[in-house]
Interface confidence: medium
Amino acid sequence: GITIPRNPGCPNSEDKNFPRTVMVNLNIHNRNTNTNPKRSSDYYNRSTSPWNLHRNEDPERYPSVIWEAKCRHLGCINADGNVDYHMNSVPIQQEILVLRREPPHCPNSFRLEKILVSVGCTCVTPIVHHVA
Amino acid sequence: GITIPRNPGCPNSEDKNFPRTVMVNLNIHNRNTNTNPKRSSDYYNRSTSPWNLHRNEDPERYPSVIWEAKCRHLGCINADGNVDYHMNSVPIQQEILVLRREPPHCPNSFRLEKILVSVGCTCVTPIVHHVA
């Protein structure tokens, strides 16, 4: 493998917890500018497993507002526009990294945290358990 | 909005870029322990809009490897197990925060970055454009 030399311009850390505590620049760089701007914004209504979006706010967290998907039905919408309970609407979940103020209310000290959010829903064939 | 008093025990910051550059504890806290442990891990195969996972690696990013969902078909799987092209499989995308080493190769200095990832796929009714 390539041996990466340590950059001589790196910040020095004399923190006894190093490298648990590091400096992070919050001037967020967005790498999405070249991606397809067509986002999944209307899929929640057009999906065969439609979902609603619920606002989750926490001022001690960055990002403070997270929108969570909740599937509208247990089943999926069929060609007639009715709910088919032989199929299941299930949330697609994703872990995301967030920053939590620690100690609370501190503007410049955070802890990385993993939280699980539901991004949308998909329609799946159910797992049927046959009883002998 | 509510004014949150500054905690007197906060670390002091004399950084001229404050509060752009902050201290972050990397001992990642997992808030998911009390959530339903049922993971969406097998949905990629059971969905009517199934997807495959593709590897994207960047050693200067955390997490370094991101597996992206790519829908297997343009259409959706119908009750007979065939692809129905009257419906569309579409990716559900979500922005996530990642950490990038900055300057490069520094083990204790990072920048937050937002990237768009495809988490899974859902089946939607197509938008039909009628030509007059």
Epitope: I92, Q93, E95 | P37, R39, S41, L53, E57, S64, W67
Partner: antibody
Framework: EVQLVQSGAEVKKPGSSVKISCKAS????????ISWVRQAPGQGLEWMGG????????DYAQKFQGRVTITADESTTTAYMELSGLTSDDTAVYYC???????????????????WGQGTTVTVSS | EIVLTQSPDFQSVTPKEKVTITCRAS??????LHWYQQKPGQSPKLLIK???YSSSGVPSRFSGSGSGTDFTLTINGLEAEDAGTYYC?????????FGQGTKVGIK
């Protein structure tokens, strides 16, 4: 080709310490962590702890907490495991294993061990 | 910690036969279950990751299934070179834990 090459066999006295190295090549060192797993003679596999090379952060199994120290040197792409207070129960083959830091199917996963070192035999005997 | 229990402990099989090894977790681990093969005097080798994904270069006769608490490793058409000990491993919760191993012998 990914390779993990470990240091040679060690014979140690009870109460002493041992430090084993694991030199990684092929692939980017920061794209994975290194875990240490041991196997006593005729026994199964036991995870001791690991390090995430990207941050240098470590996790240890409670059984070894306070006795094991895992470090990594990014400049030489080498990980180290030091075990102190050795007893005869620590006689085992010690393996380093590569653990990718991945965002898998929607999760920040702790992972499979996709490549393993050849093993280092440590014998503790008076 | 999560306890993984494999069965059987030992299996003696004729070449070309199908081998099934099960691994049961003491609690739900989603799909974070991996399978390794270890031949005598060698390091373990990853066969299956995340319950059902084959590691690169692993013969197609090896497959994995299951989620939650019950998992299966299947060898469809055992070959002589498949003799060894098979371990399951969970990475859902720290500490990582392994099953006690299943030794597969050739008749």
């Amino acid at each position: 080709e990914v390779q993990l090459v470990q240091s040679g066999a060690e014979v140690k006295k009870p109460g002493s310490s041992v430090k084993i190295s694991c030199k990684a090549s092929g692939g980017s060192f920061t794209s994975y962590g290194i875990s240490w797993v041991r196997q006593a003679p005729g026994q199964g596999l036991e995870w001791m702890g690991g390090i995430t090379n990207f941050f240098g952060s470590t996790d240890y199994a409670q059984k070894f907490q306070g006795r094991v120290t895992i470090t990594a040197d990014e400049s030489t792409t080498t990980a180290y495991m030091e075990l102190s207070g050795l007893t005869s129960d620590d006689t085992a083959v010690y393996y380093c294993a590569r653990e990718p830091n991945e965002f898998w199917n929607g999760y920040f996963a702790t992972n499979d061990f996709d490549y393993w070192g050849q093993g280092t035999t440590v014998t503790v005997s008076s | 910690e999560i306890v993984l229990t494999q069965s059987p402990d030992f299996q003696s099989v004729t070449p070309k036969e199908k081998v099934t090894i099960t691994c049961r977790a003491s609690q739900n681990i989603g799909s974070e279950l991996h399978w390794y093969q270890q031949k005598p005097g060698q390091s373990p080798k990853l066969l299956i990751k995340y319950a059902s994904y084959s590691s690169s270069g692993v013969p197609s006769r090896f497959s994995g299934s299951g989620s939650g608490t019950d998992f299966t490793l299947t060898i469809n058409g055992l070959e002589a070179e498949d003799a060894g000990t098979y371990y399951c491993h969970q990475s859902s919760c720290l500490p990582h834990t392994f099953g006690q191993g299943t030794k597969v012998g050739i008749k």
